[in-house]
Interface confidence: low
């Protein structure tokens, strides 16, 4: 999916009052500086396509994210603020109905919901400018 | 647990300038923005500008272009800024404050105990 | 820049009443944040994003608003929450409100 022609304003204010709580009530217990941050993104839509990346496919050792509060919140402001994300999603969403597995907080997801954090992060502040 | 810690009081002359610090610790030095606040003795907050230790990016309040600049160490996890051409009007506490943008939008939550700059001859 | 302006500078009030001290922005701004600050220290965050209260802010404060008018309220003023509070927008740059001065009788 190209992210490009999204509306960033309202995904910023939904990630603001309420995906961002969720990803750090996920986090509770975690030391900010456990994990370092090894995926970045350069632009907007670049950003959501990594958090889109990371939030819904699994990933060896973290399989379980995509029915997390923050994955469902997200999943929502993708759908309501990008044209035609939601189409695209319904093959992958009965794809993952079918295999829903038990639901296991291991470090690894630890590890990748704090690289979504960052890449939030950069998503709501695009870099200044070097002057 | 954050601190932010900065430099000590300064006296200086007109004309001069000055350099303060601001060590972080506690957390990641890069993750996070760190602004600069001016406070003149019994009046309001001023914020002077912004920088990223990601990478080195500033902004600042047109008023204070020229006047401040905002350099950061990331070996060091220290921020810094100087002030040139120092004049009476200069003389404030300053403070360093770091900007945390994963927290209900973007607010200076943590603060250092502020550096107090003296100008006079 | 955006302007912001508080009103009253000074507010003058008695252990358990209601008090409310507003911010207005010369343009509209998406969230205000809200400081407090005691003589001699540094200002703390004391509600974020309009209405979230910081960490250990007494349940008894709370904040609202949108666009240009922003206000913070005290359901019943208590004597440590005599103080300078401060509005913070962060839409277009960063700018403080000249602060209120909340004094208890």
């Known amino acids: 999916y190209d992210f490009t022609n999204c509306d960033f304003e309202k995904i910023k204010a939904a990630y603001l009052s309420t995906i961002s709580k969720d990803l750090i009530t996920y986090m509770s217990g975690t030391k900010s500086t456990e994990f370092n941050n090894t995926v970045s993104c350069s632009n907007r839509p670049h950003c959501l396509t990594e958090i889109q990346s990371l939030t819904f496919n699994p990933t060896a050792g973290c399989a379980s994210l995509a029915k997390e509060m923050f994955a469902m919140k997200t999943k929502a402001a993708l759908a309501i603020w990008c044209p035609g994300y939601s189409e695209t999603q319904i093959n992958a969403t009965q794809a993952m109905k079918k295999r829903r597995k038990r639901k296991v907080t291991t470090n690894k997801c630890l590890e990748q919901v704090s690289q979504l954090q960052g890449l939030w992060r950069r998503f709501n502040r695009p870099l200044l400018k070097q002057q | 647990e954050v601190q932010l810690q900065q430099s000590g009081p300064v006296l200086v002359k007109p004309g001069a300038s000055v350099k303060m610090s601001c060590k972080a610790s506690?957390?990641?030095?890069?993750?996070?923005?760190m602004n600069w606040v001016k406070q003149s003795h019994g009046k309001s907050l001023e914020w002077i500008g912004i920088?990223?230790?990601?990478?080195?990016?500033?902004s600042y309040n047109q008023k204070f272009k020229g006047k401040a600049t905002l350099t950061v160490d990331k070996s060091s996890s220290t921020a810094y800024m100087e002030l040139n051409s120092l004049t009476s009007e200069d003389s404030a506490v300053y403070y360093c404050?770091?900007?945390?943008?994963?927290?209900?939008?973007?607010?200076?939550?943590?603060w250092g105990q502020g550096t107090s700059v003296t100008v006079s001859s | 820049q955006i302007v912001l302006s508080q009103s009253p500078a000074i507010l003058s009030a008695s252990p358990g009443e209601k008090v409310t001290m507003t911010c207005r922005a010369s343009?509209?701004?998406?969230?205000m944040h809200w400081y407090q600050q005691k003589p001699g220290s540094s200002p703390k965050p004391w509600i974020y994003?309009?209405?979230n209260l910081a960490s250990g802010v007494p349940a008894r404060f709370s904040g609202s608003g949108s666009g240009t008018s922003y206000s913070l309220t005290i359901s019943r003023v208590e004597a440590e929450d005599a103080a300078t509070y401060y509005c913070?927008?962060?839409?277009?740059?960063?700018?403080f409100g000249g602060g209120t001065k909340l004094e208890i009788k």
């Open positions: 404050a770091r900007e945390d943008y994963d927290y209900d939008g973007y607010a200076m939550d943590h």
């Open positions: 506690g957390y990641t030095f890069t993750d996070d923005y």
């Open positions: 920088i990223s230790p990601y990478n080195g990016g500033t």
């Open positions: 343009s509209s701004v998406s969230y």
């Open positions: 994003a309009t209405s």
């Open positions: 913070q927008q962060w839409s277009s740059n960063r700018t």
